[in-house]
């Protein structure tokens, strides 16, 4: 069975084809080759000589037991080599010779028992080494690591490392890898020698499900003393053994580390006193809790020095009390409990993401809701009922506003966005908005992107609501049940490049409303009910138009519409997916491609 | 279509068939077997995925006595610092995991429950597997 050609001459998928040897019938130009799940078993030298241009090679689960000297010799362009799930028993010292451009080596679940005799010391270009899910017992980083000066990611998770000693990291003192991210999760740790991490600098350290008791956790974290880490991730996994007890003593040792960003990811335990618990983390710049349950929500009003707070997928009794002077970014998403938003006091806040919480807002939105006048980014998407009771007074700095899939109330009672002269992006898609007031978008003089799909208009008519949006480049009006539009609806949109009118109820096409759209490049009218043109004589669309989508409409392929069908043929160079433009009537022509019709009308006259 | 039996409990019998053409082997054990009136137990899965499990989610199509419920999307792996350790599993890596579950206070009417589980993962998104579970429910007391 042949390999699947994914990208001609470049990418080939030969997965699970029962190959016992490497195929030689693929082009020399092959750059990406997936040979996974084939019983190759043995790689002799120069095994891939037929692929001189290869950049990515996937040999996952190929039952490889032996890799000879120079197996990959000649692959000087290879950047990624994946060996996951091979039961390697014999790995020659020169197994990886010739890989002068290798950046990513994945040797997950390959029976690797030690880093010491893993022959990779010459791979100077290596950026990522993944040796997770192996049998490694010692964390001693061999001397050859001093050659791996580009290493950025080392994944040692799911190994058998129990202890870390001062000598294990000696090589890092000789060559401070300022950018190294280290994952030690799921190793059964019980001892970290104090001083082992002294004066070590890491970009990221991940320790999840490493400790089987609170005491072990406490002493191991104390053993990290002296470490300078940009991002520290602690926590557990839901499907692994969890700590039975967790209290403030667990994290006391963090006072002896220098941490820029901290994250606690999943804890099967109720956090009831976060002030004491995170006492050593009051001055990290970014603080993050993922999948934890928080009992006392008042604690977030303590004077933490965080600039970025992230609360994701957590459980709260009620919406937390947030009073944080220095906070610039707040991400509060996909949380449960506390369904009603309550005011926060965050005077420095610039970025606020409150999406996917099922929250309801009794009144939205003004400075008093968020306690800031600096807000530039506000995401309230995928929430509950949001009642518009103020037009963003004190929030004039906003540049990005997203309400999609929330239920907006009172949108047509006043000019909701009047203050937002700096707003660039607005998404009110699928918000149950019914446009019944022409001043709905007044004030949005800087707006470039407007998404309002899935809403509705009074009498299914699009009025002149865009008159002030002179900088608009993208407009989505799809799924709005529109049947008609004002001939001057788009007259002020001279910068508009993309207009989506798909999935509406238009029965005819008219070029007149688009005459002022001098920058229009994409017009999508797919999934309407277009049968014919509004007027007999259709003019040309703006000369800038490059893509016109008229697919899945109800074209009437009869003589009375001959001029319209001819006009469509004349637009051929603009049309996309022409094979999906089919006749709907008459019944004998149903399903026929519109462009293949030979329209001669004598016989039917 | 070959049917794979999972388990029987006092009020339910659970089995599954594959609904994709690849039919990559997957081993599923539930201990103790699910009782629909209330249940607490462990789900054990042994599987070698044909693609990375990063950004794994399930599309669930549930049918109750021939009545179709709306499609549900259950995100399992978001992509970074996920709740489950198997979210970091790579294509070809053995996934051998036990997940605890519990639910209570749901009253099910007697009949045949079908649940098509479409597992989607990776970037670009592709189907990982598709299983159709059949639960025959015979409540002791309705």
């Amino acid at each position: 069975e042949p390999c699947v050609e994914v990208v001609p001459n470049i990418t080939y998928q030969c997965m699970e084809l029962n190959f016992y040897k490497i195929p030689d019938n693929l082009p020399f130009s092959t750059k990406n080759l997936d040979l996974s799940f084939n019983p190759l078993r043995h790689l002799g030298s120069y095994s891939f000589f037929s692929f001189p241009e290869l950049q990515v090679l996937d040999l996952s689960r190929c039952e490889i037991q032996t890799i000879e000297d120079g197996a990959y010799q000649s692959l000087s362009h290879l950047s990624t080599l994946i060996l996951t799930g091979n039961p390697i028993q014999s790995l020659a010292l020169g197994a990886f010779s010739g890989l002068s451009s290798l950046q990513k080596l994945v040797a997950v679940e390959t029976n690797l028992a030690s880093l010491e005799n893993f022959p990779i010391g010459h791979l100077k270009t290596l950026k990522e080494l993944n040796v997770a899910h192996n049998l490694i017992q010692s964390f001693k980083l061999p001397e050859y690591f001093s050659n791996l000066t580009n290493l950025e990611h080392l994944d040692l998770s799911s190994n058998k490392i129990q202890s870390i000693y001062c000598t294990d990291l000696r090589v890092l003192h000789q060559m401070p890898l300022l950018n190294l991210s280290l994952d030690l999760s799921l190793n059964p740790m019980n001892f970290i020698q104090p001083g082992a991490f002294k004066e070590i600098r890491l970009h990221k350290l991940t320790l999840r499900n490493n400790f089987d008791s609170l005491n072990v956790m406490k002493t191991c974290i104390q053993g990290l003393a002296g470490l300078e880490v940009h991002r520290l991730v602690l926590g557990e996994f839901r499907n692994e053994g969890n700590l039975e007890k967790f209290d403030k003593s667990a994290l006391e040792g963090l006072c002896n580390l220098t941490i820029e960003e901290f994250r606690l990811a999943y804890l099967d335990y109720y956090l009831d006193d976060i002030i004491d618990l995170f006492n050593c983390l009051t001055n990290v710049s970014s603080f993050s809790l993922v999948s934890v349950t928080i009992e006392r929500v008042k604690d977030f009003s303590y004077n933490f020095g965080w600039q970025h707070l992230e609360l994701v997928n957590c459980k709260f009794g009620q919406f937390p009390t947030l009073k944080l002077k220095s906070l610039k970014r707040l991400t509060f998403t996909s949380n449960k409990g506390g369904n009603a938003f309550s005011e926060v006091d965050l005077p420095s806040l610039e970025f606020l993401d409150l999406s996917r919480n099922g929250l309801s807002f009794k009144g939205c939105c003004s400075q008093s809701d968020f306690g800031t006048t600096s807000l530039k980014y506000l995401d309230l998407s995928f929430n509950g009922v949001i009642t518009m009771s103020s037009n963003f007074l004190g929030l004039e700095q906003l540049e990005h506003l997203d309400f999609q899939h929330s239920n907006l109330k009172q949108m047509s009672e006043f000019s909701v966005f009047l203050s937002l002269r700096n707003l660039i992006y607005l998404d009110i898609s699928h918000t149950h908005t019914r446009v019944a007031f022409n001043g709905i978008f007044n004030g949005l003089s800087s707006l470039e992107v407007l998404k309002m799909a899935g809403n509705s208009f009074q009498e299914n008519f699009l009025p002149d609501i865009f008159t002030e949006l002179r900088n608009l480049t993208f407009l989505d009006l799809s799924q709005c049940q529109l049947e008609q539009l004002s001939p001057t609806a788009f007259n002020s949109l001279s910068s508009l490049q993309v207009l989506n009118m798909s999935h509406n109820n238009f029965f005819s096409l008219d070029t007149f409303p688009y005459k002022c759209l001098n920058s229009l490049q994409v017009l999508d009218y797919s999934l309407n009910h277009i049968m014919t043109s509004k007027k007999q004589e259709l003019q040309h669309f703006p000369s800038s138009l490059a893509f016109l989508n008229l697919t899945q409409n109800d074209f009437a392929c009869t003589c009375e519409h001959q001029s319209f069908l001819q006009w469509i043929k004349d637009q051929r160079q603009l049309l996309v997916e022409v094979e999906r433009m089919e006749c709907a009537t008459p019944s004998d022509k149903q399903g026929m491609p519109v462009l293949s019709l030979n329209i001669t009308c004598q016989m039917n006259k | 279509q070959k049917q794979y039996w999972v388990c029987n409990s006092s009020d339910a019998s659970i089995s599954y068939t594959y609904c994709d053409k690849m039919q990559y082997p997957i081993s599923i054990n539930v201990n103790p077997c699910i009782e629909l009136k209330r249940s607490k137990g462990l789900l054990h899965i042994f599987y070698i995925p044909r693609r990375d499990l990063k950004q794994l989610y399930f599309n669930l199509y549930i049918t109750v006595n021939t009545m179709n419920l709306p499609k549900r999307k259950e995100v399992i792996c978001r992509g970074s610092d996920d709740d489950y350790s198997f979210c970091r599993a790579l294509k070809g890596e053995t996934v051998n995991t036990t997940i605890s579950f519990s639910f209570k206070g749901i009253k099910f009417s007697k009949g045949k429950y079908k649940c098509v589980v479409e597992a989607i993962s990776g970037s670009p998104e592709e189907m990982l597997f598709c299983l159709e579970f059949v639960i025959l429910h015979q409540p002791n007391s309705n």
Epitope: K21, D24, F28, G44, S45, Y46, S50, E68 | -
Partner: nanobody, 112 residues
Framework: EVQLVKSGGGLVQAGESLRLSCVAS????????MGWYRQAPGKQGESVAI???????YYPDSVKGRFAISRDNAKNTVYLQMNSLKLEDTGVYYC??????PGQGTQVTVSS
């Protein structure tokens, strides 16, 4: 056991030509991809010519138009014709059958 015996290396001047040949024993080359790989001192090794069973060939840009690979299945031999040799063509040239490795190298030295 597969053996590859090479001949034709030596010292030549820039601009001159040289022909390398490689005779295989213990295997029939008619079903094998064959090629030449070179290793210059202090430089990254590279494949300089490959020929498949159907006669299709590959050359990197560095030798394209100057080198030509050919095979004689009857003689179980593969050849490398090297024309307009440059100083940077100096190195040890190996005859290769994928998965079976190279034979002994043959030294080619191009002098000015």
């Amino acid at each position: 056991e597969v053996q590859l015996v090479k001949s034709g290396g030596g010292l030549v001047q820039a601009g001159e030509s040289l022909r390398l040949s490689c005779v295989a024993s213990g295997i029939s080359i008619s079903t094998e991809v064959m090629g030449w790989y070179r290793q210059a001192p202090g430089k990254q090794g590279e494949s300089v010519a490959i020929i498949k069973t159907d006669g299709s060939t590959y050359y990197p840009d560095s030798v394209k138009g100057r080198f030509a690979i050919s095979r004689d299945n009857a003689k179980n031999t593969v050849y490398l014709q090297m024309n307009s040799l440059k100083l940077e063509d100096t190195g040890v040239y190996y005859c290769v059958i994928p998965g079976r490795g190279p034979g002994q190298g043959t030294q080619v030295t191009v002098s000015s």
